[in-house]
């Protein structure tokens, strides 16, 4: 769920998600539309697609709570729990490391980006 995601992103990136990523650009945070603004925004757009796929599979993406371990900078999704919990952890792990990979191109000006400026084709999943 959302608590797992927040904790994981903070552990991996070292940034407070609520201050740095939710929202950011056109796709980080709730909702998303238009062309992603940069690599970090692409991470979130891909994560939205990951969640959309799980929703079509009947998973409760915001409620399901999964177990994972964080050690030596790596995330290990526990093999405990349901299929949905496993897949949700995999989605969140991917976005966390994607955000970390793109810290060097993070743009403060895209923090709280005004969503009406998000134009262009929204990428398909």
């Amino acid at each position: 769920g959302i608590l797992n995601l927040n904790k994981m992103v903070k552990q991996v990136t070292g940034k407070m998600p609520i201050l740095s990523y939710w929202p950011y650009g056109c796709h980080c945070g709730l909702g998303g539309r238009g062309q992603p603004k940069d690599a970090t925004d692409w991470c979130c757009q891909t994560h939205d697609c990951c969640y959309d796929h799980l929703k079509t599979q009947g998973c409760s993406i915001y409620k399901d709570y999964y177990r994972y371990n964080f050690s030596q900078g790596n995330i290990h999704c526990s093999d405990k729990g349901s299929w949905c919990e496993q897949q949700l952890c995999a989605c969140d792990k991917e976005v966390a490391f994607c955000l970390k990979r793109n810290l060097d191109t993070y743009q403060k000006r895209l923090r709280f980006y005004w969503r009406p400026h998000c134009r262009g084709q929204t990428p398909g999943c």
Epitope: T56, Q57, G58, C59, S60, D64, D79, G81, S82, W83
Partner: antibody
Framework: QVTLKESGPGILQSSQTLSLTCSFS??????????VSWIRQPSGKGLEWLAH???????RYNPSLKSRLTISKDTSRNQVFLNITSVDTADTATYYC????????????????WGQGTLVTVSA | QIVLTQSPAIMSASPGEKVTISCSAS?????MYWYQQKPGSSPKPWIY???NLASGVPARFSGSGSGTSYSLTISSMEAEDAATYYC?????????FGGGTKLEIK
């Protein structure tokens, strides 16, 4: 060779607490990833998952029965326990303990090993 | 929680006959698992991850399906196949079982 064996009181009165024991061999509950579930089956009816305990003492319960269930373990004695409080005649069933398959399979991969079951009758 | 509905509840088949047991889920699941249970015995794992036969299960058994519709098929019924078959999911918490299909030999 993995084996599990359940034991219980056989018969008990309504409103009492049911205490069940699962004694197992062929694996250790201290091994990472390991866990044991309790599942029950009223006579002539279907199966109902009750609870699960993991190697690290993490526990999961069936939401519909959670308030009445307590699962625990004694790793050194290779035993898992289940207590059900305030039983009534609807709790009359055969109770099984079961274990998931070996890695690389997951929790969601079902139950590969089952005990023989222990019949519990709750009298009014 | 996901409800699994098996059909038929009871059926009988002649030796050599093809048998199909269905399991319908109240919402989409990723995999289905099947168990065989004979009177006085505990359930045995029979099919895992929808279509994989457990160790020792005869090749006349097969499993298939996706989404909300799954099935177990016996290509040619034999006397030893008479048993109750249960489907099970753990797509979402908690794990749930179907009500069972009792298969009898004619």
């Amino acid at each position: 060779q993995v084996t599990l064996k359940e034991s219980g009181p056989g018969i008990l009165q309504s409103s009492q607490t049911l205490s069940l024991t699962c004694s197992f061999s062929g694996f250790s509950l201290s091994t990472s990833g390991m866990g044991v579930s309790w599942i029950r089956q009223p006579s002539g009816k279907g199966l109902e998952w009750l609870a699960h305990i993991y190697w690290d003492d993490d526990k999961r319960y069936n939401p519909s029965l959670k308030s009445r269930l307590t699962i625990s373990k004694d790793t050194s004695r290779n035993q898992v326990f289940l207590n059900i409080t305030s039983v009534d005649t609807a709790d009359t069933a055969t109770y099984y303990c079961a274990r998931r398959p070996e890695a690389p399979y997951y929790d969601y991969d079902g139950f590969a090993y089952w005990g023989q079951g222990t019949l519990v009758t709750v009298s009014a | 929680q996901i409800v699994l509905t098996q059909s038929p509840a009871i059926m009988s088949a002649s030796p050599g006959e093809k048998v199909t047991i269905s399991c319908s889920a109240s919402s989409s699941v990723s995999y289905m698992y099947w168990y065989q249970q004979k009177p006085g015995s505990s359930p045995k794992p029979w099919i895992y991850r929808t279509s994989n036969l457990a160790s020792g299960v005869p090749a006349r058994f097969s499993g298939s399906g996706s989404g909300t519709s799954y099935s177990l098929t016996i290509s040619s019924m034999e006397a030893e196949d008479a048993a109750t078959y249960y489907c099970q999911q753990y797509h979402t918490y908690p794990p749930t079982f179907g009500g069972g299909t009792k298969l009898e030999i004619k």
